[in-house]
């Protein structure tokens, strides 16, 4: 978790002088409670926005917006603490809005926003806005929290962000799988424009149970420049057991920007459907999947049909 690196952070608006400060997430009012404290935020909203750094990199950010309740407690509002908690790592980052002037009665509702928390693809967060000073130990809570799920790198807008491009989001391997004679499977995919090695992993399962019955890994050496964007072929010899027929093929690249953590692409090949005449029918369509690196999400975005999701020919 970090803040976007550019621009002085601003929270001032007409009628209010305000400064944004780094926060330890432990406001002084926790330790030294005040007698009079403001009410909680109203209508907290979290949205996915995108912002450029000074270097021109594009990052997903959490756009946090909330309003004040229309009660007299605004006279005791000294600021706000914004906290973003990454649910899985328990990492927390806070900033503090410090009001340098008192809020005045306003013709319209006071509204605040902040868009500088950088978030990671596929990660889950809890965003909290605490009004300051925080309440006395038995006082009514004066904070509001919302959860926030960041789409992964297959989301159309996420795909072009710097963290996603660094993990290979623009590479479309267009994996095809062909069943050959003699218990063989040919996997074909398009190489990316980088001289980097690849791994092709095959794991087979029985049709009835989800237990693995066969697995093998093949290495593909780094292609030369003239081979960029060409098709690479790998042939696997399958398990001799006819029931070990549900195959999961995964292509893992090792791009220099993401090394072992690059986005993987995969297809699954279901067991063939046997007709009455016992002649195996061709499988109509393989079920394609996008396999993430270990720290990102397996979610698939609506806006992005077709990215590594193709009909695979036999």
């Amino acid at each position: 978790l970090r803040l976007l690196d550019h621009r002085a952070l601003v929270c001032s608006q007409p009628g209010l002088n305000c400064t944004v400060k780094n926060s330890t997430c432990l406001d002084d009012s926790w330790i030294h409670p005040r007698n009079l404290t403001p009410s909680s935020p109203k209508d907290l909203q979290i949205q996915l926005h995108f912002a450029h750094t000074q270097q021109g990199d594009l990052f997903p950010v959490a756009h946090i917006e909330w309003t004040l309740q229309t009660d007299a407690s605004i006279l005791y509002l000294e600021g706000a603490e914004l906290s973003v908690l990454q649910l899985n790592t328990n990492e927390r980052l806070c900033v503090k809005f410090q009001f340098l002037s008192m809020l005045q009665h306003h013709r319209k509702r006071w509204r605040f926003s902040f868009s500088h928390f950088v978030v990671d693809p596929g990660q889950e967060y809890e965003v909290t806005v605490h009004h300051l000073p925080k309440p006395i130990p038995d006082g009514d809570p004066n904070h509001q929290s919302k959860n926030f799920l960041v789409p992964d790198c297959e989301h159309a807008r996420m795909k072009v962000t710097t963290p996603c491009m660094s993990s290979g989001s623009l590479w479309d391997p267009n994996i095809t799988v062909e069943t050959l004679e003699a218990h063989q499977l040919r996997v074909s995919f398009t190489l990316w424009n980088e001289s980097t090695p690849y791994q092709v992993l095959l794991e087979s399962f029985s049709d009835s149970e989800n237990h693995s019955c066969f697995d093998v890994v093949k290495q593909i050496f780094a292609p030369r420049q003239e081979e960029f964007h060409q098709r690479a072929n790998v042939t696997f010899t399958l398990s001799k057991f006819h029931w070990c027929c549900h195959h999961h093929v995964q292509v893992q690249p090792f791009f220099s920007s993401c090394l072992n953590d690059c986005l993987r692409h995969a297809v699954t090949v279901p067991c063939p459907v046997i007709s009455n005449t016992t002649v195996p029918k061709p499988v109509a369509d393989y079920i394609p999947l996008w396999e993430p690196r270990s720290g990102s999400s397996d979610y698939k975005d609506d806006d992005d049909k077709g990215s590594s999701h193709h009909h695979h020919h036999h």
């Epitope: 909203q45 979290i46 649910l87 899985n88 790592t89 328990n90 889950e124 929290s145 919302k146 959860n147 926030f148 799920l149 789409p151 270990s294 720290g295 999400s297 397996d298 979610y299 609506d302």
Partner: antibody
Framework: QVQLVQSGAEVKKPGASVKVSCKAS????????ISWVRQAPGQGLEWMGW????????KYAQKFQGRVTMTTDTSTSTAYMELRSLRSDDTAVYYC?????????WGQGTLVTVSS | EIVMTQSPATLSVSPGERATLSCRAS??????LAWYQQKPGQAPRLLIY???TRATGIPARFSDNGSGTEFTLTISSLQSEDFAVYFC?????????FGGGTKVEIK
């Protein structure tokens, strides 16, 4: 291929405890949280809580607070859910699921029957 | 806690027809809604999250509309494998809560 494989069915007496396991494969356990959800026979789904294998942090539904403990063993890529002081209305299928908000992969479920 | 209400409890539809399932939240949950499909004897399966984003491998015939408190799951042309129970779930605030489910059965 992401898989969550749960332990087998259990029959318990009222007042006893049950510990259900959930073994993860096809991804790194510490990369995502594990949530637990239960479903009484013929009923809907009820969220029990989650654990982060990365940090050990937990969040439990208030209803189960003090009666449930969620743990993980990263060496075996396994998550555990222990429910104590069982009552007959705890009879349900208990599911583990990956992630903490929208649950993208689920275990096959473990039926826990509480009966005297 | 946020109460999720699904309607109807049972929906009878012929194969090939459109099915429309409703889910209402007791307060605004923005777009923090997921839909799951559950078949008898199986675990739930994530269909949609973020109110409109399909999960991996979910066909385009599944779509969601709505934000705030009113959500609708639409199955544009029901296939035989779509007959199941569907649950909505909010993940806006703790605790996570599920709707009571809508059973889609063959007419």
């Amino acid at each position: 291929q992401v898989q969550l494989v749960q332990s087998g069915a259990e029959v318990k007496k009222p007042g006893a405890s049950v510990k259900v396991s959930c073994k993860a494969s096809g991804y790194t356990l510490t990369s995502y949280g594990i949530s637990w959800v239960r479903q009484a026979p013929g009923q809907g789904l009820e969220w029990m809580g989650w654990i982060s294998a990365y940090s050990g942090n937990t969040k439990y539904a208030q209803k189960f607070q003090g009666r449930v403990t969620m743990t993980t063993d990263t060496s075996t890529s396994t998550a555990y859910m222990e429910l104590r002081s069982l009552r007959s209305d705890d009879t349900a299928v208990y599911y583990c699921a990956r992630r903490q908000l929208a649950l993208d992969y689920w275990g096959q479920g473990t039926l826990v029957t509480v009966s005297s | 806690e946020i109460v999720m209400t699904q309607s109807p409890a049972t929906l009878s539809v012929s194969p090939g027809e459109r099915a429309t399932l409703s889910c209402r939240a007791s307060q605004s949950i923005s777009s923090n809604l997921a839909w799951y499909q559950q078949k008898p004897g199986q675990a739930p399966r994530l269909l949609i999250y973020g109110a409109s984003t399909r999960a991996t491998g979910i066909p385009a015939r599944f779509s969601d509309n709505g934000s705030g408190t009113e959500f609708t799951l639409t199955i544009s042309s029901l296939q035989s494998e779509d007959f199941a129970v569907y649950f909505c779930q909010q993940y806006d605030t703790w605790p996570l809560t599920f709707g009571g489910g809508t059973k889609v059965e063959i007419k």
